[in-house]
Amino acid sequence: QDVRVQVLPEVRGQLGGTVELPCHLLPPVPGLYISLVTWQRPDAPANHQNVAAFHPKMGPSFPSPKPGSERLSFVSAKQSTGQDTEAELQDATLALHGLTVEDEGNYTCEFATFPKGSVRGMTWLRVIAKPKNQAEAQKVTFSQDPTTVALCISKEGRPPARISWLSSLDWEAKETQVSGTLAGTVTVTSRFTLVPSGRADGVTVTCKVEHESFEEPALIPVTLSVRYPPEVSISGYDDNWYLGRTDATLSCDVRSNPEPTGYDWSTTSGTFPTSAVAQGSQLVIHAVDSLFNTTFVCTVTNAVGMGRAEQVIFVRETPNTAGAGATGG
């Protein structure tokens, strides 16, 4: 009956952690004698290829220095402890402690048997490091040039994390990779870049970090902060201002970051009706007269700059009763 070595094609272990490389000789065959078990690293330099051996009488041996006896152990193999006990070598699973990047590679588990001869199996050990993720908005000011408005950083991952962004804005990402402080790890930084405008301020974008150590991608929301001058519009005019009307109001509606520091109401004609009273963002009209046949201008300032909006007013002689709407205000 043929025997075979059962190993996993690939085993993943966490940097600094402990990993087991399973290795079993199957099936159990009466009279099949396991004379020696060895673990080798075929791709390592010649003086580091022999990793471990288990001799039925002498037990385990670990040639130093890499990985060395401090970091290696056989999980289940047992040596003969006397004339009444046989060695148990069918399970040659090897534990590797304090994983380092240098431990990554191919490992061959080999059983020397009689009478079947030598049989072996190979496992690829991958050393991975779970990255630590963070994302943050960059406070930027309105500009015509593409600017980084958010950063997403995945620190000290192995292999490098994959970063993408979820957003409906018109953006592009710029990625850099640098070596982490832990040997063999990589810190990935992705810059979410766009032409910063008021449209982007307050918008939440999501950084998506994928890594094989995660069960599912990490999703980190980031609310963008763009400082921009006031974007102004005027509301309250309903196309039904008539002479003598007393309940009219214009509102200066503003989107800005930071908050407005001042509102200024004026007219393009230079003449300002005395019955119009500016109260911050509102212009309250006590009584409409012919001077209101003009264009009102609301100018808003903040720390970044100023913005303005105009509203043309047409004063009727009598109310427009057909489809007159609300006056706003």
Partner: antibody, heavy 116, light 107 residues
Framework: QVQLVQSGAEVKKPGSSVKVSCKAS????????IHWVRQPPGKGLEWIGA????????NYNQKFQGRVTITADESTSTAYMELSSLRSEDTAVYYC?????????WGQGTTVTVSS | DIQMTQSPSTLSASVGDRVTITCRAS??????VVWYQQKPGQPPKTLIY???YRYSGVPDRFSGSGSGTDFTLTISSLQAEDVAVYYC?????????FGQGTKLEIK
């Protein structure tokens, strides 16, 4: 402790047979293969074959196939190696040895001389 | 069968010398090689197993290396008691086969 004690020296005629015994003690006889290795005078070592006392399974070097029989008697913890159709080149010291990782335990050797 | 070819057949060296014996397999045997020492009138004793692992009780002046087809036994500083015949043996494939031996003498 493990001991393998072999039978005494033999002088045989060409064409005859010889049966060498190896009595084991100090371990579970049925759990380990007993191997036979020979060494002609002034020459190197040559593996002949082995027996597994647990089920009397045997395994031979093709070179000796048909001329050698290796058996084991569980009741006496003794292994036997019988070589037939002897010729002068079979003159050698014959060792029984127990495989524990390597050939770690050996009998004292039995000298077989084939001479007319 | 796998042939194991040892060289040299005879080696004469002085006490304190570094001595190297080589063994070449006719096909790949991995690291499944044992080195034995045999003194006159005695059975062989294991020195090295799995090509490079020193057997218990063996002085650390004995070391082994190699894999695949080429193997080496090194005595770093020859002692008078090391006079013996040295054999390599492969256990990768049935039948087990031995090298023809290297006789080590003191000058």
């Amino acid at each position: 402790q493990v001991q393998l004690v072999q039978s005494g020296a033999e002088v045989k005629k060409p064409g005859s047979s010889v049966k060498v015994s190896c009595k084991a003690s100090g371990y579970i006889f049925t759990s380990y293969w007993i191997h036979w290795v020979r060494q002609p005078p002034g020459k190197g070592l040559e593996w002949i074959g082995a027996v597994y006392p647990g089920n009397s399974d045997s395994n031979y070097n093709q070179k000796f196939q048909g001329r050698v029989t290796i058996t084991a008697d569980e009741s006496t913890s003794t292994a036997y190696m019988e070589l037939s159709s002897l010729r002068s080149e079979d003159t050698a010291v014959y060792y029984c040895t127990k495989l524990v990782g390597t050939f770690d335990y050996w009998g004292q050797g039995t000298t077989v001389t084939v001479s007319s | 069968d796998i042939q194991m070819t040892q060289s040299p057949s005879t080696l004469s060296a002085s006490v304190g010398d570094r001595v190297t014996i080589t063994c070449r397999a006719s096909q790949n045997v991995g690291i499944n090689v044992v080195w034995y020492q045999q003194k006159p009138g005695q059975p062989p004793k294991t020195l090295i197993y799995s090509a490079s692992y020193r057997y218990s009780g063996v002085p650390d002046r004995f070391s082994g290396s190699g894999s695949g087809t080429d193997f080496t036994l090194t005595i770093s500083s020859l002692q008078a008691e090391d006079v013996a015949v040295y054999y390599c043996q492969q256990y990768n494939t049935n039948p087990f086969t031995f090298g023809q031996g290297t006789k080590l003498e003191i000058k």
